[in-house]
């Protein structure tokens, strides 16, 4: 049943004498395993015997025995799937039909495979794309319908007989579908490759030549041109003639049109291979080329730079940068059209030649205000000297210079005066737009160049101003030197350190915190009476009479300032004690008599003691001793003693006389 056998393998296999052939093959015998396999060469069916006749190249039987002469041919298959075969070496007479006779337990099949063995290695085949254009990458393919595991080969590419540098990718196929060896080469042809021979060479493993295929490259490209100019250096002077010739060195396909370009722009009515320029002007300087087109596109020649030489034109000056800030760097560039380029320059600042400046550029590393002005230049080349152009203006900007704060008032300034200050400067660019003053008020305010300080304070020490344009320049501060009367005048006791006792040595100091001017005079005063003119008031031995209200005055040329009144207190023991009697020193018995201990003391007497004529202390301690009713026996001499924190004092004796009343005399 033929439908039960399915085979897959290449229809024809190619090889050459001495090589080998590898036949990839698969099959399916659906009724069971293969029991017998015979490989015939050119098999023919014999109807009489119902068998195939032909040369048996290989035979395998149930017992697996293979004749020894069959080693050249190998069956590499199995009993149910694989029917791969190898013939190594293969011979010319192996060409023809190979028959695979397969038998299973119940079925038989003959499968035919064509084998083409040539006498010599057959050439590979080069495949090219339909069109090749310059600089466009193409893939060249070299294909050989041969591959065998036992016979390694290689394909090499050559251009004009020289191996090509580009790396080729070789691939092989040994499958039931196809058997081949292929080499692919990626290649970007240039116009110069047009007409060149490309070879794919078949070599054995040792690099020995076996066969090859060649093709001639047809590289489509734009016209390749050469331009020739007379004179050859393309340097002329105004009025000379110039001839340019365009030659086509290669074009594929043939060219169709010709044109000339100057600086990339087409020249009208110039459609021949020769360009004649008569009596050239400097405007005709530029880059010339010819352009020839074909179906691929336009081709351009190299550019010829035609230089029409002329003397420098009037120059202009370019400044980098104006306005310039003082201290910055500035570059001046002299621009003058000339051919050849100027070799020498003359520079002018405000019409005066700048010595030693002969270059196209002038660089000033540190600009100063005096550099401002007009800069012009003159350019010179071998054909002559140009004219001086209009020049360029350099504006040098800088902060205000020499800023000073000036006091407008007549000196000296006195406390409370209105002071006027002005902010002056020498120069400024750009102009001064505002001023600042130090110290600032709490609310910064716009200020003119004049500052009025009304009711100037005594401590208004220094003032500074700034004149401002884009920058502020501060003046050195000026001292107002405000003059004022002595301040904070006060009396200070230097000694003694503790309270003043009568008899102490006492020194009072007249202090003040500040005075301007510093030269001062002192005055001491007590109760409107001048006491002294020194800073100190000294008492060698203070007495209670010195106590009182003292003031000191400090004078300078601006005015005088008095201290607050200072009370001088002298402490002394009770003194000038005396006993006064009321109503008198003679009192009638029965009446009332009051004895008072009068004294002068500081602090006041705190304690009194009374004594009688026997110096007996009486049990009375107040300032007044009251006798009521007074008796005759109270008559006698009394004295008192006063005590304070400083000491004690006693009075002299005072005699009290108590006389009898008329009643007592009457009773006697």
């Amino acid at each position: 049943d033929s439908s039960k056998w399915v085979f897959e393998h290449p229809e024809t296999l190619y090889a050459w004498e001495g090589a080998c052939v590898w036949i990839p093959c698969t099959y399916r015998a659906l009724d069971g395993d293969l029991e017998s396999f015979i490989l015939f060469h050119n098999p023919e069916y014999n109807k009489n015997t119902s068998k195939f006749d032909g040369t048996r190249l290989y035979e395998s039987t149930k017992d697996g025995k293979v004749p020894s002469e069959q080693k050249r041919v190998q069956f590499l298959g199995d009993k149910n799937k694989n029917c791969t075969l190898s013939i190594h070496p293969v011979h010319l007479n192996d060409s023809g039909q190979l028959g695979l006779r397969m038998e299973s337990k119940t079925e038989k099949w003959m499968e035919r495979i064509h084998l083409n063995v040539s006498e010599r290695p057959f050439p590979p085949h080069i495949q090219l794309p339909p069109e090749i254009q310059e600089s466009q990458e193409v893939t060249l393919t070299c294909l050989l319908n041969f591959s065998c595991y036992g016979y390694p080969i290689q394909l090499q590419w050559l251009l004009e007989g020289v191996p090509m540098r580009q790396a080729a990718v070789t691939s092989t196929s040994l499958t039931i579908k196809s058997v081949f060896t292929r080499s692919e080469l990626k290649f970007s042809p240039q116009w110069s490759h047009h007409g060149k021979i490309v070879t794919c060479q078949l070599q054995d493993a040792d690099g020995k030549f076996l066969s090859n295929d060649t093709v001639q490259l047809n590289v489509k490209h734009t016209p390749k041109l050469e331009i020739k100019v007379t004179p050859s250096d393309a340097i002329v002077r105004e009025g000379d003639s110039v001839t340019m010739t365009c030659e086509v060195s290669s074009s594929n396909p043939e060219y169709t049109t010709v044109s000339w370009l100057k600086d990339g722009t087409s020249l009208k009515k110039q459609n021949t291979f020769t360009l004649n320029l008569r009596e050239v002007t400097k405007d005709q300087s530029g880059k010339y080329c010819c352009q020839v087109s074909n179906d691929v596109g336009p081709g351009r020649s190299e550019e010829v730079f035609l230089q029409v030489q002329y003397a420098p034109e009037p120059s202009t000056v370019q400044i980098l940068h104006s306005p310039a800030v003082e201290g910055s760097q500035v570059e001046f560039l002299c621009m003058s059209l000339a051919n050849p380029l100027p070799t020498n320059y003359t520079w002018y600042h405000n019409g005066k030649e700048m010595q030693g400046r002969t270059e196209e550029k002038v660089h000033i590393p540190k600009i100063l205000p005096w550099h401002a002005g007009t800069y012009s230049c003159v350019a010179e080349n071998i054909l002559g000297t140009g004219q001086r152009g209009p020049g360029a203006e350099l504006d040098v900007q800088y902060p205000p210079k020499k800023v000073t704060t000036v006091i407008q008032n007549p000196m000296p300034i006195r406390e409370g005066d209105t002071v006027t200050l002005s902010c002056n400067y020498n120069s400024s660019n750009p102009s001064v737009t505002r001023y600042e003053w130090k110290p600032h008020g709490a609310w910064e305010e716009p200020s003119l160049g004049v500052l009025k300080i009304q009711n100037v304070g005594w401590d208004n020490t220094t003032i500074a101003c700034a004149a401002c344009n884009s920058w502020c320049s501060w003046a050195s501060p000026v001292a107002l030197n405000v003059q004022y009367a002595p301040r904070d005048v006060r009396v200070r006791k230097i000694k003694p350190l503790s309270e003043i006792h009568s008899g102490n040595s006492v020194s009072l100091q007249c202090d003040f915190s500040s005075s301007h001017p510093k030269e001062v005079q002192f005055f001491w005063e007590k109760n409107g009476r001048l006491l002294g003119k020194e800073s100190q008031l000294n008492f060698d031995s203070i007495s209670p009479e010195d106590a009182g209200s003292y003031s000191c005055w400090v004078n300078n040329s601006i005015g005088q300032t008095a201290s607050k009144a200072w009370t001088l207190e002298v402490l002394y023991a009770p003194r000038r004690l005396r006993v006064s009697m009321s109503p008198g020193d003679q009192v009638m018995e029965g009446k009332s008599a009051t004895l008072t201990c009068e004294s002068d003391a500081n602090p006041p007497v705190s304690h009194y003691t009374w004594f009688d004529w026997n110096n007996q202390s009486l049990p009375y301690h107040s300032q007044k001793l009251r006798l009521e009713p007074v008796k005759v026996q109270h008559s006698g001499a009394y004295w008192c003693q006063g005590t304070n924190s400083v000491g004690k004092g006693r009075s002299p004796l005072s005699t009290l006389t108590v006389y009898y009343s008329p009643e007592t005399i009457g009773r006697r």
Epitope: R434, K438, P439, H440, G441, A442, W443, E444, E445, P446, I453, G457, W458, D459, N460
Partner: antibody, heavy 114, light 110 residues
Amino acid sequence: EVQLVESGGGLVKPGGSLRLSCVASGFTFSNAWMNWVRQAPGKGLEWVGRIKSKTDGGTADYAAPVKGRFTISRDDSKNTMYLQMNSLKTEDTGVYYCITGATDVWGQGTTVTV
Amino acid sequence: SYVLTQPPSASGTPGQRVTISCSGSSSNIGSNYVYWYQQLPGTAPKLLIYRNNQRPSGVPDRFSGSKSGTSASLAISGLRSEDEADYYCAAWDDSLSGPVFGGGTKLTVL
């Protein structure tokens, strides 16, 4: 007599906007640099910003906490300074005073509650 | 926080002398004038002292200002009950390019 009168205060939600005005009289307004100062409830005084006179450039300067949110402008023809307050925050609450630096006169203030 | 530093409170009895201090730095008090403002309850601040120690007309001579280095002080002598108010110092600040204030001192007349 120099006089400044603020207006435009009120209640606004956080993120909202308000525009205060300060009308001046009794001095040459166009020459003066004008200031805004604010006072949070129970707190001290804080400078908000100022605008210079047109002759001094007419530019405005601002304290850091309000920069980018508040804009001071002036209309010399109306003797008026404005404070445009955007993206208001709760900490912007307070009394806003306008001051002329020239005479150090303060307005009566206008209250802003955020 | 305020750029200039003042004590939060001060007090005194009628007739007494009270001093309020204000401390700053070289960029404000150290190089610029000091101003003092009085703010009575519910009113706008009023200028009391300008240019360190100058009094505007109408301000009693009981109020005096002084400055030394980076500090300033306001002295009120003969204290009166109507002096009870908040007192603020102010100065221009060169670094901030604007005026700066102290946190204020609440003066109580006992």
